[in-house]
């Protein structure tokens, strides 16, 4: 059967969170999970390493924290489990622009029915160019 | 068959971008994948994590803009495809001794006979030890 | 047979590096390899995916350098191998909160009887949530 | 030829601001920082601070800091210091240097600029 | 900021022979294998010129007979044959951290 793996890229249109995500497009894949509202919805309980990449930029700093969550969802549980984050606090020089990423990847446990999303601290601050801005699993 | 797998190492001698690599030595590995002029050529098509990891350093910062992209070229498409980037800007106090390194990670579906490449804006900025610099993929 | 996998997380009751980490509860799991004293020790020969993300902050930036190191020891080699490290240098503006991660990657060839660990440089400048600061491979 | 060429001496009256002007030419510009470094008459050389010749900000000696003010114009290549309330311990040249970021120290230098503080 | 100190103030050598400088920090001015320790050579008139960098390293252009060593906080900058266009100031200083600082200079004078 085909491979569970995704990978997600950066959708603009991106207006809350968690992100949105474009799934079909240029470098964009999904095979074996679903993709949902911003979610990633396990197909079958397994190993997965799971990804994320977020590209945060501005035009004037004034050193907001920047926060970058991988996060899980199950109906079973009531509150969200984050699997992975970063959190950038005073990484640029004051009123001048600036530019930089965040990336996580890390293997978990995944249970068939799990949601996974990613959520971020300012929205208005990331560039969502396929290249920069992504998203992804695969099944061990 | 053996898998196909790569783990290139920095390599001193790089003179010009795309950048080339240690394939032989040292921590360096390729299986069923070939290292052509600083470009990994796929064998064989299929789903593939390339990861790669610049580290950069320089010893009175100037907050040059630093790129890191790995981009794929085949001779069906006239121009590159990146794949992955991360741009830096602003990112120490001027003046001042720096180091920091960018880290890409993802699945793309790669085709036989693609060439992934790793580019970068600084040459002169760039460590290339084999612990700090290094460009790889393997097949899912 | 069960795949050779492990994802060890943060142990906020480390005093001494090479760092400890926790393997039983959360969202750590362990199969096929080993874990102990602060290293995973493989059990079987192969290529693997090794991974670590450590979590810096601190209340009062100094620009310390950071070092965030995975090693290798094999009781064949008197020295340890360095496998991946990342090395950070004027990275916030001093007086200030900060905070920021390291995030290292790669496939590796290693024997049976290899141990694994991580190394830093700043033991105190760690936060040790799980989501944040973790250690894992997998088996290709 | 790679060259930094400063303006010339001044002559000034404790209180008022000198601005002093380096000129770089036979290199990028703006690959390296500029540098600004002082020796009074018969002393050893005192750094004053750096400017991003990419970025336009600086980083100042204590000792200068509120006085000292360095910037850059990038469309002429040239970077400018100003120190401001004048006193006759100023009285120095004052030299610009450039620093490569990928290299370990200020490899060129200006032919430096004489500021006399007199009343 | 880091203290750069001189010795000694003056030396006083003949042609041909050799000249020892030293320079001690008040703390290390290493970092991840290198040496940030520069050393400048300035004659009257002119601004410094740039002899040794990161300790060791010879800048192009200079002639052999100058050589560094050094590390941590102690260094030394070493002229093998004294030529006559050698007699002039010599500075260390630091650019491991800011503020960049200099030793006070050594005055190297014909005997």
């Known amino acids: 059967e085909p491979r569970s793996v995704a990978h997600l890229t950066g959708n603009p249109h991106s207006r809350s969170i968690p992100l949105e995500w474009e799934d079909t497009y240029g470098t964009a894949l999904i095979s074996g999970v679903k993709y949902k509202k911003g979610g990633l919805v396990i197909n079958e309980t397994g190993l997965y390493f799971v990804y994320s990449k977020v590209y945060f930029r501005g035009q004037s700093c004034n050193n907001q924290p920047l926060n970058h969550k991988v996060y899980m969802r199950n109906s079973k549980y009531p509150e969200d489990l984050v699997l992975m984050e970063e959190k950038r606090l005073n990484y640029c020089t004051t009123g001048q622009i600036w530019a930089h990423s965040s990336y996580l990847g890390a293997v978990f446990n995944l249970t068939s029915a799990d949601h996974l999303y990613v959520n971020i601290s300012q929205l208005s601050l990331i560039n969502f160019e396929e290249s920069k801005t992504f998203f992804g699993l695969y099944k061990l | 068959e053996p898998r196909s797998v790569a783990h290139l190492t920095g390599n001193p001698h790089s003179r010009s971008i795309p950048l080339e690599w240690e394939d032989t030595y040292g921590t360096a590995l390729i299986s069923g994948v070939k290292y052509k002029k600083g470009g990994l050529v796929i064998n064989e098509t299929g789903l593939y994590f390339v990861y790669s990891k610049v580290y950069f350093r320089g010893q009175s910062c100037n907050n040059q803009p630093l790129n890191h992209k790995v981009y794929m070229r085949n001779s069906k498409y006239p121009e590159d495809l990146v794949l992955m980037e991360e741009k830096r800007l602003n990112y120490c106090t001027t003046g001042q001794i720096w180091a920091h390194s960018s880290y890409l990670g993802a699945v793309f579906n790669l085709t036989s006979a693609d060439h992934l490449y790793v580019n970068i804006s600084q040459l002169s900025l760039i460590n290339f030890e084999e612990s700090k610099t290094f460009f790889g993929l393997y097949k899912l | 047979e069960p795949r050779s996998v492990a994802h060890l997380t943060g142990n906020p009751h480390s005093r001494s590096i090479p760092l400890e980490w926790e393997d039983t509860y959360g969202t750590a799991l362990i199969s096929g390899v080993k874990y102990k004293k602060g290293g995973l020790v493989i059990n079987e020969t192969g290529l693997y995916f090794v991974y670590s993300k450590v979590y810096f902050r601190g209340q009062s930036c100094n620009n310390q350098p950071l070092n965030h190191k995975v090693y290798m020891r094999n009781s064949k080699y008197p020295e340890d191998l360095v496998l991946m490290e990342e090395k950070r240098l004027n990275y916030c503006t001093t007086g200030q909160i900060w905070a920021h991660s390291s995030y290292l990657g790669a496939v590796f060839n290693l024997t049976s009887a290899d141990h694994l660990y991580v190394n830093i440089s700043q033991l105190s400048l760690i936060n040790f949530e799980e989501s944040k600061t973790f250690f894992g491979l997998y088996k290709l | 030829q790679v060259q930094l060429v400063q303006s010339g001496a001044e002559v000034k009256k404790p209180g008022a601001s000198v601005k002093v002007s380096c000129k770089g030419s036979?290199?990028?510009?703006?690959?390296?920082?500029i540098h600004w470094v002082r020796q009074a008459p018969g002393q050893g050389l005192e750094w004053m601070g750096v400017i991003s010749t990419y970025q336009g900000d600086a980083s100042y000696n204590q000792k200068f800091k509120g006085r000292a003010t360095m910037t850059v114009d990038k469309s002429t290549s040239t970077a400018y210091m100003e120190l401001s309330s004048l006193r006759s311990e100023d009285t120095a040249v004052y030299y610009c240097?450039?620093?490569?970021?990928?290299?370990?120290?200020?490899?060129?230098w200006g032919q430096g600029t004489l500021v006399t503080v007199s009343s | 900021e880091i203290v750069m100190t001189q010795s000694p103030a003056t030396l006083s050598v003949s042609p041909g022979e050799r000249a020892t400088l030293s320079c001690k920090a008040s703390?290390?001015?290493?970092?991840?294998?290198?040496?940030?320790m520069n050393w400048y050579q300035q004659k009257p008139g002119q601004p410094p010129r740039l002899l040794i960098y990161a300790a060791s390293n010879l800048e192009s252009g200079i002639p052999a007979r100058f050589s560094g060593s050094g590390s941590g906080t102690e260094f030394t900058l070493t002229i093998s044959s004294l030529q006559s266009e050698d007699f002039a100031v010599y500075y260390c200083?630091?650019?491991?951290?800011?503020?960049?600082?200099f030793g006070q200079g050594t005055k190297l004078e014909i005997k």
């Open positions: 200083q630091q650019s491991r951290e800011l503020p960049y600082t």
């Open positions: 703390q290390s001015v290493d970092y991840d294998g290198d040496s940030y």
């Open positions: 240097a450039r620093f490569p970021d990928w290299d370990y120290a200020m490899d060129y």
């Open positions: 036979g290199y990028t510009f703006t690959d390296y920082t």
